[in-house]
């Protein structure tokens, strides 16, 4: 569950559940910073614009990131 915060981390809970790349509207990868010492991944789904915090350590999520970056590199000229 993400919470909007100016300081500190956004994600309160994280999911290991794989996400279908086709159902993704947006995938935000927030690098660790002075405000939050960990990487955060926030998926926005096409359906209802629902958001979900993903576990960066999960194998399924790592595979999702690979799939998304592969898709992006296909699209870019």
């Amino acid at each position: 569950v993400p919470l909007s915060r100016t300081v500190r981390c956004t994600c309160i809970s994280i999911s290991n559940q794989p996400v279908n790349p086709r159902s993704l509207e947006k995938l935000e990868i927030i690098p660790a910073s002075q405000f939050c010492p960990r990487v955060e991944i926030i998926a926005t789904m096409k359906k209802k614009g629902e958001k979900r915090c993903l576990n960066p350590e999960s194998k399924a999520i790592k595979n999702l990131l690979k799939a998304v970056s592969k898709e992006r590199s296909k699209r870019s000229p």
Epitope: V1, C11, I12, S13, P37, E50, K51, R52
Partner: antibody, heavy 121, light 109 residues
Framework: QVQLVESGGGVVQPGRSLRLSCAAS????????MHWVRQAPGKGLEWVAL????????YYADSVKGRFTISRDNSKNTLYLQMNSLRAEDTAVFYC??????????????WGQGTTVTVSS | EIVLTQSPGTLSLSPGERATLSCRAS???????LAWYQQKPGQAPRLLIY???SRATGIPDRFSGSGSGTDFTLTISRLEPEDFAVYYC??????????FGPGTKVDIK
């Protein structure tokens, strides 16, 4: 099955301290934010505190800020609430509850049975 | 701090009737951040509705949620004997406290 079990409640004098525990089982505790919610006798629900899945984020209700501390031990699948400077108005049933991680906000989907704290001289 | 007001305080109805419970916020709440809970005497609360309108796992379809902004509604289409309880709305906005409403008691007429 998914379960939360609170313990540590009891009768305590005003100004004293008490530590509540909440043992989690049946799910990946280290992925879930956790809440404490209380209910005074005959009253409604009052949110008390929240801790993020890895303990980085902590949030408190104004009524307990500076007196209560929420913490967790992910290696033991246990949530804690350290309560100091207790007052009569802290008398309540204290519930721990799981912040459901599979969405933006899916509410508190798993609750313990509650533990009773009575502050009385 | 967002304050939630629930009405009516008590709703006296018979089994089979429709129950309409209201939850009003003192300022706009994103629909994603509103939940409804049911609590029976001596029991812990149970999540019914999240995101204002999505039913939690295992919740019968006679329960439905609607609304946006400051006005939200929980509807029980046909009351079953086990539905007589207290119902709370809760907001989980962009900053704490994650307040609950004062509750609506649905009792048997």
């Amino acid at each position: 099955q998914v379960q939360l079990v609170e313990s540590g409640g009891g009768v305590v004098q005003p100004g004293r301290s008490l530590r509540l525990s909440c043992a989690a089982s049946g799910f990946t505790f280290s992925n879930c934010g956790m809440h404490w919610v209380r209910q005074a006798p005959g009253k409604g629900l009052e949110w008390v505190a929240l801790i993020g899945y890895d303990g980085i984020n902590e949030y408190y209700a104004d009524s307990v800020k500076g007196r209560f501390t929420i913490s967790r031990d992910n290696s033991k699948n246990t949530l804690y609430l350290q309560m100091n400077s207790l007052r009569a108005e802290d008398t309540a049933v204290f519930y721990c509850a799981r912040d459901w991680p599979e969405g933006y906000y899916n509410g508190m989907d798993v609750w313990g049975q509650g533990t009773t704290v009575t502050v009385s001289s | 701090e967002i304050v939630l007001t629930q009405s009516p305080g008590t709703l006296s109805l018979s089994p089979g009737e429709r129950a309409t419970l209201s939850c009003r916020a003192s300022q706009s709440v994103s629909s994603s951040y509103l939940a409804w809970y049911q609590q029976k005497p001596g029991q812990a609360p149970r999540l019914l509705i999240y995101g204002a309108s999505s039913r939690a796992t295992g919740i019968p379809d006679r329960f439905s949620g609607s609304g946006s902004g400051t006005d939200f509604t929980l509807t029980i289409s046909r009351l079953e004997p086990e539905d007589f309880a207290v119902y709370y709305c809760q907001q989980y906005g962009s900053s704490p406290p994650f307040t609950f409403g004062p509750g609506t008691k649905v009792d048997i007429k």
